[in-house]
Interface confidence: low
Amino acid sequence: QLTIESRPFNVAEGKEVLLLAHNVSQNLFGYIWYKGERVDASRRIGSCVIRTQQITPGPAHSGRETIDFNASLLIQNVTQSDTGSYTIQVIKEDLVNEEATGQFRVYPELPKPYITSNNSNPIEDKDAVALTCEPETQDTTYLWWVNNQSLPVSPRLELSSDNRTLTVFNIPRNDTTSYKCETQNPVSVRRSDPVTLNVLYGPDAPTISPLNTPYRAGEYLNLTCHAASNPTAQYFWFVNGTFQQSTQELFIPNITVNNSGSYMCQAHNSATGLNRTTVTAITVYAELPKPYITSNNSNPIEDKDAVTLTCEPETQDTTYLWWVNNQRLSVSSRLELSNDNRTLTVFNIPRNDTTFYECETQNPVSVRRSDPVTLNVLYGPDAPTISPLNTPYRAGENLNLSCHAASNPAAQYFWFVNGTFQQSTQELFIPNITVNNSGSYMCQAHNSATGLNRTTVTAITVYVELPKPYISSNNSNPIEDKDAVTLTCEPVAENTTYLWWVNNQSLSVSPRLQLSNGNRILTLLSVTRNDTGPYECGIQNSESAKRSDPVTLNVTYGPDTPIISPPDLSYRSGANLNLSCHSDSNPSPQYSWLINGTLRQHTQVLFISKITSNNNGAYACFVSNLATGRNNSIVKNISVSSGDSAPGSSGLSASGSGSGLNDIFEAQKIEWHHHHHH
């Protein structure tokens, strides 16, 4: 069946619409479009003959219609009057007609709506406002948006029956709600600009800032008053009840304490006609100067004077505080504060008081602290000390004594030696001292402020250093069992102790060893060969000790009875005879051999080769010590045999004088002595 479709069905004014014929038969001769619901030649828009491709406009053609060979009708730039029905008449080649009717509607493009209000300045929580969506247009739907949300259900919002008017009740001051209206028809949707309500309110109680913090003299006072108000409030300032100015800010440069007082701000709303006031108290304090401390006594005497410290200057509305060694003042029996804390009294001040005192002044705008003050406490002098202490001094050294007494002010010093004034210095210096400088040294300390004196005495001893001692002897070569030896420790020294060592051992006194002359002389009675020493002497006093070099005694002794070796008495004929003689003696003895009474030789060894029986006889060894003047001898009888016989030994000794053998020996000794001196 032949039908007509409108594309689109609802057409916006000024746009175009296309009418399409559907189910058109084949083998068409042509077709004709009419305005309206029926075929009416007077309302023909145009026709189309397919075979000749001829399109002919009709009386209803406005110049905006275009007919196409596919049986479509395009109408451009449509107007409201184009709304309605359109009919197509299709003529087949058999000249049988077919008809169909279609339609469309034309709607205007809506303008952007806007909102009008019956009251632009409602008063909070009092006035209602009617908002109307303009313009009024036909076939239009009206919608409202509140804060970009669709209209909520609220007792404060009411719509008119056509939705074009929205009434808002009880509007609060902080209502920043945005209202928009929307218009709709089938071809357009438009939304207005947002509207917010200018709610009149206030003034509220004004606030003054900054708040009543203390102010410093010399600053400026700049107070700002603010009251929530619409329209903006007008402001009026009153100081202590007197009108000052009608500005939001009150500015007073370089304020003084006279600017303290009651500051009132009045806020006025010209629309609501209301007034509200707020009062603040302003206190102006002078900036405190740096304080300083004065004292009634700059030089107190220890444990005696009290000192009163005062914090200056005295200023109004000021709190005074004291600091002792950087610590807030604590309660003490030695410290006393005045009622206003401005004066601090210090009692019983000890000498070592290095306490520093500071005072602090405070008011609400400033805190200042003084420079520290310490007290100069007078004391002393204490008993002076002399240094170094009274150690003994060696003659030839320098004596340098220093005196010190704790004292403030510093003490003056005076030196006395053995009661005689020497000098007024802290140090006493004597170069190259002698024993004459020994004595009593007194230092006197004087404090010029307290007027006191104190003294101290020290004893100085000067000693001479001992020399190194040496030993002298009355006999360097004593003879054993005959001589006594006297050893003397030199030199003689006063106040000196003498000591002796024998064989590196302290001397043990015995009947043969005697000390005399204050131990300076050591006597050895009847020396023996074991008394050689070494001997040392030492001298000492309280300051030093010295020891001599060792000395040994050359004790002469002997000769002791000689010994002939070997001990054999019998020899074979033809053997060698080799006899050796030895005697203990100092100095070494002289040896002589006598055979059968005849002197043979002056040697310690007697040698005879290839002995025979002729060598039988008495062999005598004679020893002589020229230092002791003593001699000794021994005789050995030797037998020479041709046969074997057991050897034997026999010896005869002789010493001293009076025997024939000794007479011979004496004669030989003289001869020997004479021989050795030529």
Partner: antibody, heavy 120, light 107 residues
Framework: ELQLVESGGVLVKPGGSLKLSCAAS????????MSWVRQTPEKRLEWVTY????????YYPDTVKGRFTISRDNARNTLYLQMSSLKSEDTAIYYC?????????????WGQGTLVTVSA | DIQMTQSPASLSASVGETVTITCRAS??????LAWYQQKQGKSPQLLVY???TLTEGVPSRFSGSGSGTQFSLKINSLQPEDFGSYYC?????????FGSGTKLEIK
């Protein structure tokens, strides 16, 4: 909008020196008393120093006296803190603060802070 | 120097509860006391000064009281945004000193 922005905080060795700056905007800087306040790693708040609006009056606690110096350049809207002879106990976040207009009392406005670390 | 002693050092509470933080001055500071709130990683913010005056924008559930040496900060009906650290500070002349802080945590 009143704004305080601190800068200059770094790691510094004990005994060293450092200068912090605070740039102010959005208010009449030359009319406000200013202070530096620091917050230690243990979260304790300590007032460091104060300067009045004209720059003629300064205060310091004993802990920093003689080592720190506060100054301001009202033409440049900038507050400074010169720190010397730094000690490990000076490690903290340093805040630039403005007092209420005409007041030297509470710290009404604070910057975001700058970290100073004193360590060998 | 004036010492400020704050208690408790820490406090756990639930949303909706009421809490009180106290601060004691070592000497009379009249009404020269401020309270600050500090949230994690942020700068301290002034809540109250002159002992009881609320800074502009601070909710009315906060209130300060006291004078002389004893002060307190009360928070009614705790909200989630109230958790953090609170410090008291005297502004009665230099040196200004702070309390050691109270950490308010969610229970």
């Amino acid at each position: 909008e009143l704004q305080l922005v601190e800068s200059g905080g770094v790691l510094v060795k004990p005994g060293g020196s450092l200068k912090l700056s605070c740039a102010a905007s959005g208010f009449a800087f030359s009319s406000y008393d200013m202070s530096w306040v620091r917050q230690t790693p243990e979260k304790r708040l300590e007032w460091v120093t104060y300067i009045n609006s004209g720059g003629g009056i300064t205060y310091y606690p004993d802990t920093v006296k003689g080592r720190f110096t506060i100054s301001r350049d009202n033409a440049r809207n900038t507050l400074y803190l010169q720190m010397s002879s730094l000690k490990s106990e000076d490690t903290a976040i340093y805040y630039c603060t403005a007092h209420y207009f005409g007041s030297s009392g509470p710290f009404a406005y604070w910057g975001q802070g700058t970290l100073v670390t004193v360590s060998a | 120097d004036i010492q400020m002693t704050q208690s408790p050092a820490s406090l756990s509470a639930s949303v909706g509860e009421t809490v009180t933080i106290t601060c004691r001055a070592s000497e009379n500071i009249y009404s020269y006391l401020a309270w600050y709130q500090q949230k994690q990683g942020k700068s301290p913010q002034l809540l109250v000064y002159n002992a009881k005056t609320l800074t502009e924008g601070v909710p009315s559930r906060f209130s300060g009281s006291g004078s002389g040496t004893q002060f307190s900060l009360k928070i009614n009906s705790l909200q989630p945004e109230d958790f953090g650290s609170y410090y008291c500070q005297h502004h009665y002349g230099t040196p200004f000193t702070f309390g050691s802080g109270t950490k308010l945590e969610i229970k």
